[in-house]
Interface confidence: medium
């Protein structure tokens, strides 16, 4: 689901996107847009990720900017004021609300921004962001059987122009034996994208015991979404990722 209105109240039913109006081509001058993102249950939290194609006029964020507040309005805990061409880091709310405010002045403009919002899952190691140059991504409970009815999002963020290499050490999900090659993976599956989920090029859909090959992502973002159904659990997966770039230690400082 995509929301490109200038302001709205969004009650999350499934992951979706909100964008500055006109994105990615241009936003208008003299805009003031406010979005309230609300989790369906009071105990849930919200995670937002900014698309790396982020472009707001960069003059100390005096004129064009997007602000994020942890709460129902501008009185909530201030999480940041952002502008320029570098996408802000992900934000996870402390409660069931996030408030986002976008302001533009009367002249210079840019492409704007796109935000993916979703419920931040409290489950063990479910829905995590990774920003270190290397790491291990495991399904919940690995190597024990994973829980049922999961939707876990794993996103690796690295500097632009870096290449992410993902290699699976172990992979065992409930198979889908009916379609040829198990390509549908109707029961439990791992989806991988070069970029944000449902946005970047889709690398593949995996299930059963066929380990995904060596996965490369060149966009600076690698996303995986792990879905499980309500029955039959396997041990899941464990994967190592690393970043290929000579100056990687500098970029991560």
């Amino acid at each position: 689901f995509r929301n490109d209105k200038c302001g709205d109240t969004i009650k999350i039913e499934s992951p979706g996107y909100l964008t500055s109006p006109g994105y990615p081509h241009s936003y208008h001058p003299s805009e003031k847009c406010e979005w309230l993102i609300q989790a369906p249950d009071p105990y849930q939290r919200i995670m937002i990720n900014f698309n790396p194609h982020f472009d707001l006029e960069d003059r100390d964020c005096k004129y064009d900017y997007v602000e994020v507040f942890d709460g129902e309005n501008e009185n909530g805990h201030f999480r940041g004021k952002f502008c320029g061409k570098i996408a802000p880091p992900p934000v996870v709310s402390s409660g069931p609300f996030l408030f986002i405010k976008f302001v533009s002045d009367y002249e210079t403009h840019g492409a704007g921004f796109s935000i993916r919002y979703e419920i931040f899952k409290r489950g063990p190691e479910c829905s995590q962001n990774y920003t270190t140059p290397s790491g291990v991504i495991k399904s919940p409970g690995f190597p024990e059987k994973y829980p049922n009815s999961l939707e876990c999002t794993y996103i690796v963020f690295v500097p632009k122009m870096s290449e992410i290499i993902l290699e699976f050490e172990s992979f065992d999900l409930e198979p889908d034996s009916n379609p040829p090659g198990g390509m549908f993976c109707r029961y439990d599956r791992l989806e991988i994208w070069d970029g944000f989920p449902d946005v970047g090029p889709h690398i593949g859909r995996y299930c059963g015991q066929k380990t995904p090959g060596r996965i490369r992502s060149s966009s600076g973002i690698l996303s995986m979404v792990f879905y499980t159904d309500s029955a039959i659990a396997k041990e899941g997966f464990s994967a190592n990722y690393s970043v290929l770039q000579s100056s990687v230690s500098e970029d991560f400082k």
């Epitope: 109006p21 790396p52 194609h53």
Partner: antibody, heavy 119, light 107 residues
Framework: EVQLVESGGGLVQPGGSLRLSCAAS????????ISWVRQAPGKGLEWVSS????????YYADSVKGRFTISADTSKNTAYLQMNSLRAEDTAVYYC????????????WGQGTLVTVSS | DIQMTQSPSSLSASVGDRVTITCRAS??????LAWYQQKPGKAPKLLIY???SRASGVPSRFSGSGSGTDFTLTISSLQPEDFATYYC?????????FGQGTKVEIK
């Protein structure tokens, strides 16, 4: 003078490929998005794809997603539309257009290049 | 996707007439609307952007209005060079979509 010039159109068989070029002069590709828009004979305008300046983020119409690829070579100030698996319904005049930075719309257009998909 | 519907699809008018073309969006697009003029065998030309701002070099007889879902292009006094097809375009969101066009013919 700000100008866009398309080339690369022609007759191609269904299933074939073609690469269109859009050469710009008078402005830099690195700062302004470029779009491709097509017009089938006797029909209206249809947006096909856009690429954003320096970062090269790409956007496609559903009708061409997976078959067409937009790209830009900023050193040559040229945008490209690689068209694969062409179908009869892709027959159209293809225009490239600049998305203005100060003007909210496609403010500069090329003259168009005709692509005919027929056996 | 946002659908754009123009009316009428064609109209006949005389030089000096006031001509109005309307464009309706299937959902609110704020003022993210542009109007283009196209003559046979030529590329489109941007007339209006932001629903009401005239592009550089466009004569003052062309004006745009509207916000939300309903928009209007008005030619206050039709000139011989204005006989053409006019398209509206929304750029609120991708995919960018055009209206089907309105052909302005000589009566």
């Amino acid at each position: 003078e700000v100008q866009l010039v398309e080339s690369g159109g022609g007759l191609v068989q269904p299933g074939g490929s073609l690469r269109l070029s859009c050469a710009a002069s008078g402005f830099s590709f690195s700062s302004e998005p470029i779009s491709w828009v097509r017009q089938a004979p006797g029909k209206g305008l249809e947006w096909v794809s856009s690429i954003t300046g320096k970062n090269g983020y790409t956007y496609y119409a559903d009708s061409v997603k997976g078959r067409f690829t937009i790209s830009a070579d900023t050193s040559k100030n040229t945008a490209y539309l690689q068209m694969n698996s062409l179908r009869a319904e892709d027959t159209a005049v293809y225009y490239c257009a600049r998305w203005g930075k100060k003007v909210y719309g496609m403010d500069v257009w090329g003259q168009g290049t005709l692509v005919t998909v027929s056996s | 996707d946002i659908q754009m519907t123009q009316s009428p699809s064609s109209l006949s008018a005389s030089v000096g007439d006031r001509v109005t073309i309307t464009c309706r969006a299937s959902q609110s697009i704020s003022s993210y609307l542009a109007w283009y003029q196209q003559k046979p065998g030529k590329a489109p030309k941007l007339l209006i952007y932001g629903a009401s701002s005239r592009a550089s070099g466009v004569p003052s007889r062309f004006s745009g209005s509207g916000s939300g879902t309903d928009f209007t292009l008005t030619i206050s006094s039709l000139q011989p060079e204005d006989f053409a097809t006019y398209y509206c375009q929304q750029y609120m969101s991708v995919p960018i979509t055009f209206g089907q066009g309105t052909k302005v013919e000589i009566k």
